[in-house]
Interface confidence: medium
């Protein structure tokens, strides 16, 4: 498959200069998140505001390597986590079958050239399962809850403004209905969605020549190599950062 080795550019697909410069990039993360024991969660980071070329993204928990997404070689999941960690969406990481021991700090480390490394921090709290809920289900992170709260506040403000301006009742219902629809749309971008906003997988054309055009037969050779060093050909490492 052609995505065994991807052609990857960062920052508007511009080649980074060889000379090292100021580190201007910023990492946006999902911040502090909570999830239920036995459930799943997506850890997401996003690098923006830099012209540096992203070469590798590492995911760590405290001092342990969880996974690596490498521009040339794709995903590597640490053998001790391979049963509970899945790559993606994008450069994110999905943690499954959560236990209370998974509570703690997680780091995404973006290796870039020529900037160096950018590190993002996420704090995950795994909560005991609620009353009769079992099995893996995705939790809405605190960011999602905050967004929902904002939507509710906005709704209230708009309703109050609408009422004070003595708009027609019909119009008020229309606005509320509209907002309800928008709110439902936002919930679709919860961590269970395949590619939430801020995901690093953007549909962008990558110029040929960065890592070399790959032919189908290369995949078999790569697969062998992955087996030797416990790499898993798990899908694309699509590195892309937005100019911000």
């Amino acid at each position: 498959m052609r995505w065994c080795l991807l052609l990857i550019w960062a920052q508007g697909l511009r080649q980074a200069p060889l000379a090292s410069g100021m580190m201007t990039g910023t990492i946006e993360t999902t911040g502090n998140i909570s999830a239920e024991k036995g459930g799943s969660i997506i850890l997401q980071c996003h690098l923006s505001s830099t012209t540096a070329q992203v070469t590798q993204v590492n995911w760590e928990q405290q001092d342990q390597l969880l996974a690596i997404c490498n521009a040339d070689l794709g995903w590597h999941i640490s053998p001790s986590f391979k049963d509970r960690v899945a790559p993606g969406p994008g450069l994110g990481l999905t943690l499954q079958s959560l236990t209370v021991n998974d509570t703690g700090e997680y780091f995404c480390i973006y290796h870039t050239y020529p900037d160096g490394t950018y590190t993002g921090r996420i704090f995950l709290e795994v909560l005991e399962s609620s009353v009769a809920e079992h099995g893996a289900r995705f939790q809405i992170p605190l960011l999602g809850a905050m967004a929902a709260t904002l939507v509710v506040i906005c709704t209230a403000v708009i309703v109050v403004v609408a009422l004070t301006r003595k708009k027609k009742a019909l119009r008020i219902h229309s606005v509320e209905g509209d907002l309800r629809r928008k709110s439902a749309g936002q919930e679709e971008w919860s961590p269970s969605a395949p590619s939430p906003p801020g995901s690093c997988v953007q549909a962008e054309a990558a110029p040929a020549g960065l890592c070399g055009e790959q032919r189908g037969e290369d995949c078999a050779e790569l697969h062998d190599y992955f087996n030797v060093l416990s790499y898993r050909s798990l899908g694309n490492c699509s590195f892309f950062t937005e100019t911000g």
Epitope: L5, Q15, A16, L18, S20, Q53, T55, Q56, N58, E60, D63, L65, I68, N70, A71, D72, L73, S78, F107, I109, H111, Y113, P114, G116, T117, T119, G209, L210, C211, G212, Q214, D218, E221, L222, Y225, V228, L229
Partner: antibody, heavy 119, light 110 residues
């Protein structure tokens, strides 16, 4: 099978230049970072230089900066090390090593080529 | 160029467990992966351990790696005569933009 074969070593005088080559086979060359690592007689390993798979990024040890240049020709599956202003301290076996990327590891090594700088 | 610190020599008798230390690894998150290499006399180095504690296929499980903070160690259990070799640790240093190798440890099987 992955194979790395170095060539170009030999005896040179101080101040002279030499170009080492490393012919790679058995893997997709353009997908791997490559490094040169040297070992002076009876001494330990010393990393010399690294180049990314696409040839965009290159890194050097302080001891060789400004004198050595690493390059690669992905169409020929060959890695190069251009060594200028050689001194006796550069005398060593030079190994070509395949990497995954900067902070990973060297998974395959060549047998090495000996460079002797002597007057 | 600074190097990682290893004891110059280590020894053990067949069947014993030997540990080789490596200190001076970058404490910066994301740059602290250690790999270990075995160099038998007159041969090229061979990858033994990668990403601190992972073994490539073909490397016996007698070899194990661990890392804590800025130090790492290589343990060899059930020592065998063919383990007599030089052992090197290596790690990338992001502040130097350079690979660092330990000075090497010569393991002697008595």
């Amino acid at each position: 099978d992955v194979q790395l074969v170095e060539s170009g070593g030999g005896v040179v005088r101080p101040g002279e230049s030499l170009r080492l080559s490393c012919a790679a086979s058995g893997f997709t060359f353009s997908s791997h970072a490559m490094s040169w690592v040297r070992q002076a007689p009876g001494e330990g390993l010393e990393w010399v230089s690294l180049i990314s798979g696409n040839g965009v990024s290159a890194y050097y040890a302080d001891s060789v900066k400004g004198r050595f240049t690493i390059s690669r020709d992905n169409s020929k599956n060959t890695l190069y090390l251009q060594m200028n202003s050689l001194s006796a301290e550069d005398t060593a076996i030079y190994y070509c090593a395949r990497g995954t990327y900067l902070i990973s590891f060297f998974d395959y090594w060549g047998l090495g080529t000996l460079v002797t700088v002597s007057s | 160029q600074s190097v990682l610190t290893q004891p110059p020599s280590a020894s053990g008798t067949p069947g014993q467990r030997v540990t080789i230390s490596c200190s001076g690894i970058s404490a910066k998150i994301g740059n602290n992966y250690v790999s270990w290499y075995q160099q038998l006399p007159g041969t090229a180095p061979k990858l033994l351990i990668y990403f601190n504690n992972q073994r490539p296929s073909g490397v016996p499980d007698r070899f194990s790696g661990s890392k804590s903070g800025t130090s790492a160690s290589l343990a060899i259990s059930g020592l065998q005569s063919e383990d007599e070799a030089d052992y090197y640790c290596a790690s990338w240093d992001d502040s130097l933009n350079a690979w660092l190798f330990g000075g090497g440890t010569k393991l002697t099987v008595l």
